[in-house]
């Protein structure tokens, strides 16, 4: 089925903290969609402090999982993160609101993080940013 085209789809999940913070995402589509992040509506400049990182691909699957990695974000990083995915068959978007503290360890998982989703195409969903 790999040669068949299917439209881009994208999912965002809640941010989690590992050695760093991660906004997990899943993206699907054939051919593999191009990705672009927006922060508060503007193109996000990726650097060694904020960057996209993919997990190892699973054999025979077109879906890719990854993180937008943020190194100990502060209030500067609070806002709306949008992931845009596009391929020749379609485009999709998902967004999530992330609220970070100056100190990630002060994050209270019981405080709800508001999440909204604006479908640009079908098959796009969003969760909360989570702490890994």
């Amino acid at each position: 089925h790999h040669h068949h085209h299917h439209p881009a789809s994208v999912q965002l999940h809640e941010a989690v903290e590992l050695h760093h913070w991660c906004i997990p995402f899943s993206v699907d589509g054939q051919p593999a969609p191009s990705l672009r992040w927006l922060f508060n509506g503007s193109v996000l400049n990726e650097t060694s402090f904020i960057f996209t990182e993919f997990l190892e691909p699973v054999a025979n699957e077109t879906v890719r999982h990854g993180c937008l990695r943020l190194n100990q974000p502060t209030h500067v990083n609070n806002g709306n993160y949008t992931l845009l995915a596009a391929n020749p068959s379609g485009r999709a978007a998902a967004f999530v609101m992330a609220a970070f503290m100056d100190n990630p360890f002060e994050f209270n998982p019981e405080d709800p993080i508001p999440v909204s989703f604006s479908p640009v195409d079908t098959n796009s969903t969003s969760g909360d940013p989570v702490e890994k």
Partner: antibody, heavy 116, light 107 residues
């Protein structure tokens, strides 16, 4: 305790090349990018580039492209910076630093002197 | 590239005085500013990241503030061990850039 230990500096003739090392310890080497900086008296700090040991990805300052190559050996937790076609302008202290919360841990620096 | 301009270039203060160092960016750097302390013959040490967050172990007499293009580092009560050069840097967009530094001397 996070530590970055630099080595490899010294006296090199113009036109020569040199490979500087930055050995990391006290943290997961492949989880963080490493930055390299150049410092000369009266010039402040100059960012040379960043290297991500997990993937080999690099970002270079355009001013250093062709002059510098960043690599790493994951098995020894060591990052390297190769400098080529050296001139007197390359004489400086070179520093590696972990890209964590800002450049949060720095090596002690290693001095390169280019002279005939 | 973004130019970071620090002022003053040098400062001479007595122990116990309050000091404010300035760092101005040539364009908006979104709060991605760090402050570094470099003592004589040592490598830089991170004091402040994200414009206002103190790095681990940094004394609370060091405070960072500012946003967009104007940033300050305040030392509420200067100590003898604060003799150093202080550098600001932006890690908002490549190439990362640093200011020329402010040298703090103790009277």
């Amino acid at each position: 305790e996070v530590q970055l230990l630099e080595s490899g500096g010294g006296l090199v003739q113009p036109g020569g090349s040199l490979k500087l090392s930055c050995k990391a310890s006290g943290y997961a080497f492949t989880n963080y990018w490493l930055g390299w900086m150049k410092q000369r008296p009266g010039h402040g700090l100059e960012w040379i580039g960043d290297f991500y040991p997990r993937t080999g990805n690099t970002f270079y300052n355009e001013n250093f492209k062709g002059k510098v190559t960043l690599t790493a050996d994951k098995s020894s937790n060591t990052a390297y910076m190769q400098l080529s076609s050296l001139t007197s302008e390359d004489s400086a202290v070179y520093l590696c630093a972990r890209a964590g919360t800002g450049f949060d841990y720095w090596g002690q620096g290693t001095t390169l002197t280019v002279s005939s | 590239e973004i130019v970071m301009t620090q002022s003053p270039a040098t400062l001479s203060l007595s122990v116990g005085e309050r000091v404010t160092l300035s760092c101005k960016a040539s364009e908006n750097v979104g709060g991605y500013v760090s402050w570094y302390q470099q003592k004589p013959d040592q490598s830089p040490k991170l004091l402040i990241y994200g414009a206002s967050s103190r790095h681990t172990g940094v004394p609370d007499r060091f405070t960072g503030s500012g946003s967009e293009t104007d940033f300050t580092l305040t030392i509420s009560s200067v100590q003898a061990e604060d003799l150093a050069a202080y550098h600001c840097g932006q890690n908002y967009i490549y190439p990362f850039t640093f200011g020329g530094g402010t040298k703090l001397e103790i009277k």
